[in-house]
């Protein structure tokens, strides 16, 4: 098994992840591991020399870069917040702030915007990943209601009057809860879901 630097006639190297073809010398050389950069280029007589990235810089992959990438903070003006700090091997991990979704994506999220409100009678469809897209509002399923305009309010089950020893005065809708009343006394309509003591 050849150890870098070694000659390559077909311009490809055995280990594509950890080696690269250097065209001036027509050889395969070692890449630098994550967290490091090339401090001296390889030649036919010397393999790549790597050095550790300085503080506040990183390289995420096996590379032949002559510099490390500068760590960048998550920009709150763009609606981003930090979930993991930058290390020599990994850039700062950001996500959209609560109530926001990613509106611009270029390998990673660069700009977040406020989630749209879901009107009464609907709720935001649950997504696999929070902050990945804007709300898609879906109607409350049968037996549930949601009575606000909100990006995050969830549909709640209608009150079951009988569980409170009450009777139904008015059925619930997608926008309102069931209205309950004391079986003995009529209740004003504004006291929906509650009992007059």
């Amino acid at each position: 098994q050849a150890v870098p630097p070694y000659a390559s006639e077909n311009q490809t190297c055995r280990d594509q992840e950890k080696e690269y073809y250097e065209p001036q010398h027509r050889i395969c050389c070692s890449r630098c591991p994550p967290g490091t950069y090339v401090s001296a280029k390889c030649s036919r007589i010397r393999d790549t020399v790597c050095a550790t990235c300085a503080e506040n810089s990183y390289n995420e992959h096996w590379n032949y870069l002559t510099i490390c990438q500068l760590c960048r903070p998550c920009d709150p003006v763009m609606g981003l917040e930090e979930i993991a700090p930058c290390t020599s091997k990994r850039k700062t991990q950001c996500r959209c702030q609560p109530g926001m979704f990613c509106a611009a994506w270029a390998l990673e999220c660069t700009h977040c915007e406020l989630l749209s409100d879901c009107p009464p009678g609907t709720e935001a469809e649950l997504k696999d990943e929070v902050g990945k897209g804007n709300n898609h509002c879906v109607p409350c399923k049968a037996g549930h209601f949601q009575n606000t305009s909100s990006p995050s309010a969830r549909c709640q089950p209608h009150t079951r009057c009988e569980n409170q020893g009450l009777v139904e005065a008015a059925p619930g809708t997608a926008q309102s809860d069931t209205t309950c009343k004391n079986p003995l006394e009529p209740l004003p309509p504004e006291m929906s879901g509650t009992m007059l003591m």
Epitope: A7, E9, P23, Q24, H25, R26, S43, R44, I45, R46
Partner: antibody, heavy 120, light 107 residues
């Protein structure tokens, strides 16, 4: 038979430009890295430029970087050296040379050379 | 840059003599050294590559030896056509650098 024939040399004033050519024959030109090497009067040899087989990569020593440009036309089996901002110290015989394409990297064939004189 | 120090710069010898020319590299060049012969008004011609290997068509009186930083070209028995200038070249690391040359003259 491998042949490399340079042309384009001549007398040029300081600050002027010149384009050298090297016509290759007798081998598959597009398979080889090509070089320009020069020799000042009464002096030794100096590497001037390299170009990869497909022409994608070019390399120069600091002494000519930014002033000289190596190029090739594989369809025409030709190598070129565009020289600009010429100085008196660029006066030399310019040779084109082929680098063998195995694993030993020596110059196996050279042209006969073309003379460039930079003088006012 | 790797400095190549070639010695002697000139040498007088007679037909039949054994001659050695040396090249010393500024650092280990791992045998990436070739030797060239140049006659007046002619292009250089390859003699030895990878420090010790004789190029095609080159007479066996020419030989190369050495490793690391020290390399030698030997002509075992000088012939009249061998009077020329000889250059070493390191191509282990860019920029490629030549020795200053050794002019071999008839004594």
């Amino acid at each position: 038979e491998v042949q490399l024939v340079e042309s384009g040399g001549g007398l040029v004033k300081p600050g002027g430009s010149l384009r050298l050519s090297c016509a290759a024959s007798g081998f598959t030109f597009s398979d080889y890295y090509m070089y320009w090497v020069r020799q000042a009067p009464g002096k030794g040899l100096e590497w001037v430029a390299t170009i990869s087989d497909g022409g994608s990569y070019t390399y120069y020593p600091d002494s000519v970087k930014g002033r000289f440009t190596i190029s090739r036309d594989n369809a025409k089996n030709s190598l070129y050296l565009q020289m600009s901002s010429l100085r008196a110290e660029d006066t030399a015989v310019y040779y084109c040379a082929r680098e063998e394409n195995g694993n030993f990297y020596y110059f196996d064939y050279w042209g006969q050379g073309t003379t460039v004189t930079v003088s006012s | 840059d790797i400095q190549m120090t070639q010695s002697p710069s000139s040498l007088s010898a007679s037909v039949g003599d054994r001659v050695t020319i040396t090249c010393k590299a500024g650092q280990d060049i791992k045998s990436y050294l070739s030797w060239y012969q140049q006659k007046p008004w002619k292009a250089p011609k390859i003699l030895i590559y990878y420090a010790t290997r004789l190029a095609d068509g080159v007479p066996s009186r020419f030989s190369g030896s050495g490793s690391g930083t020290d390399y030698t070209l030997t002509i075992s028995s000088l012939q009249p056509e061998d009077f020329a200038t000889y250059y070493c070249l390191q191509h282990g690391e860019s920029p490629w650098t030549f020795g200053g040359g050794t002019k071999l003259e008839i004594k």
